[in-house]
């Protein structure tokens, strides 16, 4: 089979007339009356068809032509290439050989970006015109007027620092400073010894250097430096004015401190989110917090607070907090975190709820107040849900039962235990699943519609009777499901029995939606039309 073979990569600058030579195999010789070869360049928006010349069965040349593509937001564009013989026979291109069209000036507005382009593009910096171009597009009167990266000595003038991150760090040093800018050298050697923060040396890290664009350096110790802030200086090989950049903002040396931890106590198992308050806490590039000598899992920080998740403690009692910000170690003997014994759950009352949950549960136990945001959890039919609890004191909290409503399974009329019931109390694993409880879930109440149309007409002062089932779950003890029935937005006085809710309707007239609520269950059986007495007495 005739086919195109890989050879050297094909790079074609936009607007330059040049031939393109392709290696091939088994190219047939066109017979008389047959059309020859053509190269098709599938350029988006402006496809090009160029006559090709077959040299022999293994070589072909797309004749002199120039190519272009739209826009300056793409610096190089790989273009699919087809070779066609005799008008419509496409020569195989199994390796998908492409032509790379490119524009030197596109996305290369600075000398550094220009010189770091792929050397095969042969782009260079036209000094006089301050633009990236091919050599013959630069009106250069001396060799130095057009710089190319291949000249090992090439170096861009006018380096610029655009951004510093972070902008503050501890005096003790160790902060990794990220400097973003333009023309910041072409090779690491260009800047290896050229970065300072004021008088303090900042040692660039080779693995994080991005040619021309980014330097990451580690700031040295500034303990002996009196100035509290300083400009950052980058010198590209030497510090002559053309090769020296100063930062637009100053880097500030600070002394981070902390003075409070909140909450100041939590369970021995850890897992408590704590906030450590202080000043300059967002300084430097790296932070590590330990509580009682163990790492506190860092979440986020700003200048006034660090948040982290406490590790398990070794024993109940106070534990020192240490913060390392780069080479600065922060301590405060006045600020200690207190580990308490893990909370326990002794009783849940009542020991039941309904499918939709939402009923109030009183939970008694020990050390409950050591956890700031306890949650009750239930798992049933493969679905797990949680609800927040309100802590009154160390021995009492109130939770709303989680809903266990799911499409797969619902509790039978006599109730059913959930697969799991427990509490999320920071990292206290022993409470995640309570094996000691006999907690049951009952089905939600089922209420009849007010009528087949959902509309019930009622005389004033007549009671509204809502029929249904599962209205009173057959739970042990004296606790009952607490109902609210609203006529519009007005609650009515209720009497509840096994099969009906008797509602002394408020003194209303007109149409009102009826809503029944019990825990997390809410349902509207329809609309009530109450006629006024005056309408009823009309003939």
């Amino acid at each position: 089979c005739p086919q195109i073979l890989p050879s050297t990569q094909i790079y074609v600058p936009v607007g330059v007339v040049k031939p393109i030579t392709l290696a091939a195999r088994n190219l047939p010789q066109p017979q008389s009356g047959q059309r020859g070869y053509e190269c098709l360049f599938h350029i988006p928006g402006s496809p090009a068809r160029v006559t090709a010349l077959r040299f022999n069965s293994s070589s072909l040349q797309c004749q002199n032509s120039s190519y272009s593509y739209e826009g300056n937001d793409v610096s190089d564009l790989p273009v699919n290439l087809s070779v066609v013989w005799n008008g419509n026979f496409v020569i195989d291109n199994p390796q998908n050989i492409q032509a790379h069209l490119y524009k030197c000036p596109a996305l290369r507005e600075s000398c550094g970006l220009c010189l770091k382009a792929d050397p095969r593009f042969e782009c260079g910096w036209c000094v006089a015109e301050r633009r990236c171009s091919l050599r013959h597009h630069c009106a250069a009167d001396t060799p130095a007027s057009w710089m190319h990266a291949r000249h090992g000595s090439s170096r861009c003038t006018d380096p610029k620092i655009l951004k510093l991150s972070p902008e503050t760090g501890p005096r003790q040093g160790g902060t990794r400073l990220t400097i973003t800018g333009e023309n910041l050298g072409l090779r690491f050697e260009d800047v290896r010894l050229g970065v300072r923060v004021g008088k303090v040396l900042c040692s660039p890290v080779e693995s994080e250097y991005i040619s021309a664009e980014q330097i990451v350096c580690e700031i040295g110790d500034a303990s002996s430096v009196r100035a509290h802030d300083a400009l950052v200086e980058v010198c590209v090989r030497d510090c002559s004015p053309h090769y020296r950049a100063l930062s637009p903002k100053r880097f500030t040396f600070v002394t981070p401190t902390f003075y409070r931890v909140s909450p100041s106590r939590g369970p021995l198992s850890g897992g408590t989110w704590i906030g450590i308050e202080g000043s300059h806490l967002n300084a430097g590039s790296d932070v590590a917090v330990s509580v009682g000598g163990r790492p506190c899992s860092f979440s986020w920080r700003n200048s006034r607070e660090i948040r982290c998740l406490t590790p398990p403690g070794q024993s109940p009692g106070s534990a020192p907090i240490i913060i390392n910000i780069n080479r600065a170690q922060l301590t405060n003997p006045e600020v200690k975190y207190n580990y308490t014994e893990d909370p326990t759950i002794l009783r849940i009352d009542p020991e039941w709820s309904i499918n939709s949950g939402g009923t109030l549960l009183t939970v008694t136990g020990t050390n409950l107040a050591t956890v700031r945001e306890p949650r009750i959890r239930a798992k049933y039919g493969g679905i797990e849900r949680e609800n927040g609890c309100l802590v009154y004191n160390d021995t009492t909290m109130v939770c709303r039962a989680p809903s266990v409503a799911n499409p797969v399974r619902s509790p039978p009329e006599l109730g059913e235990r959930p697969d799991e019931l427990g509490f999320v109390m920071d990292n206290v694993r022993s409470l995640l699943v309570l094996n000691s409880t006999s907690f049951l879930y009952y089905p939600d109440p089922v209420l009849e519609p007010l009528s087949p149309t959902g509309l019930l007409e009622l005389k004033p002062s007549s009671p509204l009777i809502l029929k249904g089932r599962n209205l009173l779950p057959p739970a042990p003890g004296n606790s009952r499901l607490n109902y609210t029935v609203l006529i519009g937005s007005t609650p009515c006085t209720l009497t509840v029995s096994e099969t009906q809710l008797l509602c002394e309707a408020p003194n209303l007239t007109g149409q009102h939606k009826v809503t029944v609520r019990a825990g997390g269950f809410e349902f509207s059986p329809g609309t009530l039309q109450v006629y006024s007495d005056s309408l009823l007495t009309l003939p």
Partner: antibody
Framework: QVQLQESGPGLVKPSETLSLTCTVS??????????WGWIRQPPGKGLEWIGS???????YYNPSLKSRVTISVDTSKNQFSLKLSSVTAADTAVYYC????????????????????WGQGTTVTVSS | DIQMTQSPSSLSASVGDSVTITCQAS??????LNWYQQKPGKAPELLIY???ELHSGVPSRFSGSGSGTDFTFTISSLEAEDAATYYC?????????FGQGTKVEIE
């Protein structure tokens, strides 16, 4: 799918009680999503709703027939029944039973859907 | 009770024609209107519910529109099997009431 079948005598004497039963197959009469209704159609005339019942036994009747109508449900047999007392020749009609769905609108609110499944009807003639 | 007035009482049309039936309620019934089709000797069948919703399995040539008191039922392209009596019925208030029917014949 759900099917309804009416059954009962085709001839009733004036002043007696007409009794019909509708048997539901292919679904449960105890579903909370449906009412079950009776409709009649006198020869050559239009449709007249007689009444509807919920599986719990709650009934709703056409005021024009209320004094003579009783509809009951037997969930164990998956049936509901119609009794119409003191019949006259004007009660001669084809009697249909039908399923009357109660659909939940947004936010768990009922709206009327329309009688979607009907029995094939049974002709009752009132004559001595 | 809510009275339902249907018109015309009968009409004759050719296959492929568009046919329109109207139904008027004696008071506002929102969108709680249904349309039924009854063929001779058969039980009625639900076509349209809630004014304009097509019941499952019903061909899309049947459509309904309107709300309040005035409603329209349309068969966009009449077919021979559409010869039947069509009834409107309201479900807004008990007792449910029906129109007197429109008999559609094929010419």
């Amino acid at each position: 799918q759900v099917q309804l079948q009416e059954s009962g005598p085709g001839l009733v004497k004036p002043s007696e009680t007409l009794s019909l039963t509708c048997t539901v197959s292919g679904g449960s009469i105890s579903s909370s999503s449906y009412y079950w209704g009776w409709i009649r159609q006198p020869p050559g005339k239009g449709l007249e709703w007689i009444g509807s019942i919920y599986y719990s036994g709650s009934t709703y009747y056409n005021p024009s027939l209320k004094s003579r109508v009783t509809i009951s449900v037997d969930t164990s047999k998956n049936q509901f029944s119609l009794k119409l007392s003191s019949v006259t020749a004007a009660d001669t009609a084809v009697y249909y039973c039908a399923r009357d769905p109660v659909q939940l609108e947004h936010s768990r609110y009922y709206y009327y859907y329309g009688m979607d499944v009907w029995g094939q009807g049974t002709t009752v003639t009132v004559s001595s | 009770d809510i009275q339902m007035t249907q018109s015309p009482s009968s009409l004759s049309a050719s296959v492929g024609d568009s046919v329109t039936i109207t139904c008027q309620a004696s008071q506002d019934i929102s969108s709680y209107l249904n349309w039924y089709q009854q063929k001779p000797g058969k039980a009625p069948e639900l076509l349209i519910y809630y004014g304009s919703e097509l019941h499952s399995g019903v061909p899309s040539r049947f459509s309904g529109s309107g709300s309040g008191t005035d409603f329209t039922f349309t068969i966009s392209s009449l077919e021979a099997e559409d010869a039947a009596t069509y009834y409107c019925g309201q479900g807004n208030r008990l007792p449910y009431t029906f129109g007197q029917g429109t008999k559609v014949e094929i010419e």
